[in-house]
């Protein structure tokens, strides 16, 4: 099958191979597309409502003044000519909207160095079939999961015209000491080939850093973070800074499920508690910070350590913040 | 053996303020935290909020943001929340549970039923 | 608000496996939910049993397993009991609030 693009809303003329210049002519058009159940037959004389869709012209071409989503399918003329030889044309017909100029909605001024910040939202309306939005940083391809850049994609469908809107939210993470006025844009790659991309105007929002921060402290009680079975272990996350952040805690690597405190305490050690923990120390005006990590570990009875923890208690075997 | 009483059924006015609370035993009362639970008649269970009885901090369900309020008597051994502008909504009963670092709600109040009524 | 989803009834023999599940209308369940699931018992009798997906609470019998199967969280009775007759609720951690499945009523005949 020859592939036939033709643009939505434009008029297509499809040829009928073999088929003599004028009637009286031996051909048929049988139609499959999304407008029909099956395949439809149409034939010179026509005639009746298909003529608004699509019609055989005096010369044996398939006519279609205006075509739209439903007419993407299967279009096979079969012709004799006055000899009656018989040439078969077979089409598969795909249709295109090219959307509008993307734009980038909701830009950030301002982001901040070594955390995650939203660059902005990418918007495409209109497109068919749907395509693809892509991320460029100084005119180079962003790749998402790569290097902090994250991206968020959401397709919607206008329910009566069947066009296509995209969305694309980019998510940084700009490294310290890097470009200050870093240059985004976004652009949009049509679903069928030989079309060109459409870009959107860039962006340059300005990198801010923030001051180094004191390291976060996370001291361990016992030392060494080894304890017998039942006992307890404290960990206190120290902060220098004022006014004091606010602490959550981790569990290889998880954020465990409390409020925020400076203090985990962990009494009654079992086996479900080893792990590496660490505290996550969030200022107001600084992104998150993280403390080292601890490995919390069990002496089995008759093992040396380098400490044991304080055995008893109630025999509410959990850990929690104090 | 640890155990969580809670204090009575309370019948009560719309607009109106009450405060349930749970006394902690059988255990460290600051080594672990206290959330509550609400559970209307015939429906499931929604999640209130915790509170760390060690440093005050708590966590609240979106929905109870402004209608409960967490605190914690560390002389006493008890966790309290108060809930305000009391409507029929709030009629349900509430639970205490005690909270592990890793959310295990291993043990359970005996439950306070809270009628709002006229 | 998340949506956690729950089997609303099932019913089992003594002696029987039973599996119950709890989905997240989010994605998949991981281990960062903290899965926790909680038995009722007449009379608003309420013990926890599992913690951290697959952490067993203090004296609860090894019949009694935490899981993740798939995209959901699911607790397994290996040999049911009649005295396991109860709703049982899971509860998922998102962030910085828990929400509580529907529960499941589990009858063993």
């Known amino acids: 099958a020859q592939n036939i693009t033709a643009r939505i809303g434009e008029p297509l003329v499809l040829k009928c191979k073999g088929a003599p210049k004028k009637p009286p002519q031996r051909l048929e058009w049988k139609l499959n597309t999304g407008r029909t159940e099956a395949w439809k037959v149409l034939s010179p004389q026509g005639g009746g409502p298909w003529d608004s869709v699509a019609r055989v012209l005096p010369n044996g071409s398939l006519f279609l003044p205006a075509v739209g989503i439903q007419d993407e399918g299967i279009f096979r003329c079969q012709a004799m000519n006055r000899n009656g030889k018989e040439t078969k044309s077979n089409y598969r017909v795909r249709v295109y909207q090219i959307p509008g100029k993307p734009e980038i909605v909701d830009s950030a001024s301002e982001l901040t160095a070594g955390v995650p910040n939203k660059v902005g939202t990418c918007v495409s309306e209109g497109s068919y079939p749907a395509g693809t939005l892509s991320w460029h940083l100084d005119g180079k391809p962003l790749v998402p999961n790569e290097k902090g850049v994250s991206v968020k994609e959401q397709t919607r469908r206008h329910p009566e015209t069947g066009l296509f809107t995209l969305q694309s939210e980019l998510m940084v993470t700009p490294a310290r000491g890097g470009d200050p006025r870093p240059t985004f844009s976004c652009s949009f790659s049509p679903g069928l080939p030989r079309h060109r991309a459409l870009r959107t105007a860039p962006i340059q929002p300005r990198v801010w850093e923030p001051v180094p921060l004191e390291e976060v402290q996370l001291v361990v009680e016992p030392e060494g973070g080894a304890v017998a079975p039942g006992g307890t272990v404290t960990l206190t996350c120290e902060v220098p800074a004022q006014p004091s952040p606010q602490i959550h805690w981790m569990k290889d690597g998880v954020p465990l499920p409390l409020p925020p405190s400076p203090v985990l305490i962990l009494p009654e050690i079992g086996p479900q508690d080893q792990g590496t923990y660490s505290c996550v120390a969030t200022h107001s005006s600084h992104g998150p910070q993280e403390s080292r990590a601890v490995s919390i570990s069990i002496i089995e009875p008759g093992e040396e350590g380098p400490t044991a923890g304080s055995v008893g208690g109630s025999g509410l075997g959990t850990l929690a913040l104090a | 053996q640890v155990q969580l009483q809670q204090s009575g059924a309370e019948l009560v006015r719309p607009g109106t303020s009450v405060k349930v609370s749970c006394k902690a035993s059988?255990?460290?009362?600051?080594?672990?935290?206290i959330e509550w639970v609400k559970q209307r008649p015939g429906q499931g269970l929604e999640w209130i909020g915790v509170i760390n009885p060690g440093s005050g901090g708590t966590n609240y369900s979106e929905r109870f943001k402004g209608k409960a309020t967490l605190t914690a008597d560390k002389s006493s051994s008890t966790a309290y929340m108060q809930l305000s502008s009391l409507t029929s909504d709030d009629s349900a009963v509430y639970f205490c549970a005690s909270y592990r670092y890793d959310g295990g709600m291993d043990y359970w109040g005996q439950g306070t039923s809270v009628t709002v009524s006229s | 608000q998340a949506v956690v989803t729950q089997e609303s009834a099932l019913t089992t023999s003594p002696g029987e496996t039973v599996t119950l599940t709890c989905r997240s209308s989010?994605?998949?369940?991981?281990?960062?939910?903290?899965a926790n699931w909680v038995q009722e018992k007449p009379d608003h009798l309420f013990t926890g049993l599992i913690r951290?997906?697959?952490n067993r609470a203090p004296g609860v019998p090894a019949r009694f397993s935490g899981s993740l199967i798939g995209d959901k969280a699911a607790l397994t009775i290996t040999g049911a009991q009649t005295e396991d007759e109860a709703i049982y609720f899971c509860a998922l951690w998102y962030s910085n609030h828990w929400v509580f499945g529907g529960g499941t009523k589990l009858t063993v005949l």
């Open positions: 059988g255990y460290a009362f600051t080594n672990y935290l």
């Open positions: 951290g997906t697959n």
């Open positions: 989010t994605g998949a369940v991981t281990t960062s939910n903290y």
